[in-house]
């Protein structure tokens, strides 16, 4: 799949993964033998990243815009290899993928846990929140998982609505082939919409954590 | 200093109303779980209401449901309850409580507590 | 609804004895459970939660004990400010009910 492909454009950096870089850059040079401590260098850059000003942190907004236009460019012209199929463009109009039962719960719960250490990383923050879910008792997890059944219920009506509006040459092909490829398309709609929330998870967490910065 | 301190009880008629209020400070209200607990004179706690940090997820006691609604103002670190239909059978002392959420595979526990006010339903 | 029973209802002892108070849930809990007291004209106060971790601030002489359907709270030299009512709490499910509540007297 696309993921060994060496032809495959690299993917976009954010503004805070360029600032990391450099980190890593500064640190090797300062100290070229020693080990790095993942856990505490990710603190320390994170707390660094917090004391910067808007100034000191354009640049790396600077390199995180024309990475973006770099990898835009370079997904234009890429094509995939054979049985791969090329990531749809994604309509802004389609109805969004609901978010789990966890997603929901990590909503109300990150604030307390990025407030009470505000050095932890978006990982680290994860894994906290994590283990917060699994010490909940199931009882208390219902209403979470009582809202993603009714916003997937929602999503389905909206997708099923979404994808009839959307498809209109369709009827000139032969039913029959329609049916039988209707299941294979949804799965693999699945499989990237799963892909999606997991970007958007890490998105949120990226946005939030520049937020917090420039409050 | 971690505080909870409740208003807005008093002497109702059965089948009236009445909103109680829980003010927070010295803590981050926003980022907990508040509950509503009561305690009939002479009698032991139960629990009534709670909701979630942001205010979106609530649950009641069966004896409540339909009848008090709890809700927040993260903005003003408040927490309220309101009373509506009143019976006899809710004359207590209601507590404001903080809830402690997941901190250990213990689940939740009601950490901080208000002094409580006194509703008293009576004709 | 889980149902929490407490005993003894409750006790009369002596400053330095060593109280024992049991909770019984109607249902297995695991270690969902919390322990508190309360003052006359007070409100409770947390003592143990997740049947066995002491809430900072709590003297070490009061200890929980237990899983599954059987808690144990146990003040192991008893002072003359524990006088109070204890009730332990199941935090398994909603509704979250308490004991009865177990009222410890000076003998």
């Known amino acids: 799949m696309g993921k060994g492909d060496p032809k495959k454009p690299r993917g976009k950096m954010s503004s805070y993964a360029f600032f990391v870089q450099t980190c890593r850059e500064e640190h090797k040079k300062k100290h070229p033998d020693a080990s790095v401590n993942f856990s505490e260098f990710s603190k320390k850059c994170s707390e660094r990243w917090k004391t910067m000003s808007a100034k000191e942190k354009g640049k790396f907004e600077d390199m995180a815009k024309a990475d973006k236009a770099r990898y835009e460019r370079e997904m234009k012209t890429y094509i995939p290899p054979k049985g791969e199929t090329k990531k749809k463009f994604k309509d802004p109009n389609a109805p969004k993928r609901p978010p789990s039962a966890f997603f929901l719960f990590c909503s109300e719960y990150r604030p307390k846990i990025k407030g009470e250490h505000p050095g932890l990383s978006i990982g680290d923050v994860a894994k906290k929140l994590g283990e917060m879910w699994n010490n909940t008792a199931a009882d208390d997890k219902q209403p979470y998982e009582k809202k993603a059944a009714k916003l997937k219920e929602k999503y389905e009506k909206d997708i099923a609505a979404y994808r009839a509006k959307g498809k209109p040459d369709a009827a000139k092909k032969g039913v029959v082939k329609a049916e039988k490829s209707k299941k294979k398309k949804e799965e693999e709609e699945d499989e990237e919409d799963e892909e999606d929330e997991e970007e958007e998870e890490d998105e949120e967490d990226e946005d939030e954590e520049e937020d917090d910065d420039d409050e | 200093e971690v505080q909870l301190l409740e208003s807005g009880g008093g002497l109702v008629q059965p089948g009236g109303s009445l909103r109680l209020s829980c003010a927070a400070s010295?803590?981050?209200?926003?980022?907990?779980?508040m509950s509503w607990v009561r305690q009939a004179p002479g009698k032991g706690l139960e629990w009534v209401s709670r909701i979630s940090p942001s205010g979106g997820y609530t649950m009641y006691a069966d004896s409540v449901k339909g009848r008090f609604t709890i809700s927040r103002d993260n903005s003003k670190n408040t927490l309220y309850l309101q009373m509506n239909s009143l019976r006899a059978e809710d004359t207590a002392v209601y507590y404001c409580?903080?809830?402690?959420?997941?901190?250990?595979?213990?689940?939740?526990?009601?950490?901080?507590w208000g002094q409580g006010t006194m509703v008293t339903v009576s004709s | 609804d889980i149902q929490m029973t407490q005993s003894p209802s409750s006790l009369s002892a002596s400053v330095g004895d060593r109280v024992t108070i049991t909770c019984r849930a109607s249902q297995s809990i695991s270690s969902y459970l919390n322990w508190y007291q309360q003052k006359p004209g007070k409100a409770p106060k947390l003592l143990i939660y997740a049947a066995s971790s002491l809430q900072s601030g709590v003297p070490s002489r009061f200890s929980g004990s237990g899983s599954g359907t059987d808690f144990t709270l146990t003040i192991s030299s008893l002072q003359p400010e524990d006088f109070a009512t204890y009730y332990c709490q199941q935090s398994y499910s909603t509704p979250r009910t308490f004991g009865q509540g177990t009222k410890v007297e000076i003998k």
């Open positions: 010295g803590f981050t209200f926003s980022w907990y779980d």
């Open positions: 409580a903080r809830l402690e959420v997941g901190a250990t595979s213990g689940g939740t526990a009601f950490d901080i």
